[in-house]
Interface confidence: medium
């Protein structure tokens, strides 16, 4: 039975150019973490590896970094960047839980950032 | 960390065969898929074969119906069982661990970041 939950950044604003932190966290649950991916739409941007680490797509090699912990780093965002991300946790026994963050990116100087936690 | 290392190249002659071997260790989880490379002097390093989430496999054309693929688990093992093996097939061969995911059913590198040091296999009569 999967008993585990995912706590994630929610909705989150960022300025055009700048970056921004995608973090989910996986709570309620004694299950291993094999594997996270992170994603967006359809397309595949970086994989946390239990075995083999960080590997990010070569597509986004120049603007995803690592981090921190099993979070996502975005830089130099551009108003293509606005839209859904997901977190994908690959656990055993459970199985896969996902969480969801919509990101929005803003031509202004101006944007408010969502609520932030740390991950211990 | 994940530690590859090949065995079983050699000298054989052409139509001879061949059983390449990877023997993966330091995982914990062993929670990736697996893939063969080669790279013959003076040229690029290319895809083989790999085995693929869900235990699918996928081949180069150069070697479809030769080269066959497989994955013992419970020996943590990759092998490479070559057939009908020609001069063209000799290169330095290695073995390579990726994440597992829906999509990584191909043969590009690029996702490949833990490699083994190569075994050399020598096809000449």
């Known amino acids: 039975m999967m008993t585990g939950t995912i706590e994630t950044t929610g909705n989150i604003s960022a300025e055009k150019g700048g970056s921004i932190i995608l973090q989910c966290h996986l709570s309620s649950t004694t299950a291993q973490v094999t594997q996270v991916n992170w994603e967006q739409q359809d397309q595949l941007l970086a994989i946390c590896n239990a075995d083999l680490g960080w590997h990010i797509s070569p597509s986004f090699k120049d603007r995803v970094a690592p981090g921190p912990g099993l979070g996502l780093t975005l830089q130099s965002l551009t108003v293509n960047d606005t839209g859904e991300y997901f977190c994908i946790y690959h656990t055993y026994p459970d199985g896969t839980y996902t969480g969801r963050i919509f990101l929005e990116v803003l031509e202004s100087s101006v944007a408010e950032h969502g609520a932030r936690f740390q991950i211990p | 960390e994940v530690q590859l290392v090949e065995s079983g190249g050699g000298l054989v002659q052409p139509g001879g065969s061949l059983r390449l071997s990877c023997a993966a260790s330091g995982y914990k989880y062993g929670v990736y898929s697996m893939g063969w490379f080669r790279q013959a002097p003076g040229k690029e390093r290319e895809g083989v074969s790999a085995?693929?989430?869900?235990?699918?496999?996928t081949y180069s054309d150069s070697v479809k119906g030769r080269f066959t693929i497989s994955r013992d688990n419970s020996k943590n093992t990759l092998y490479l069982q070559m057939n009908s093996l020609r001069a063209e097939d000799t290169a330095v061969y290695y073995c390579a661990a990726r994440p597992l995911w829906t999509g990584d059913c191909d043969l590009s590198s690029s996702w490949y970041k833990t490699w083994g040091q190569g075994t050399l296999v020598t096809v000449s009569s």
């Open positions: 085995i693929c989430s869900g235990g699918r496999t």
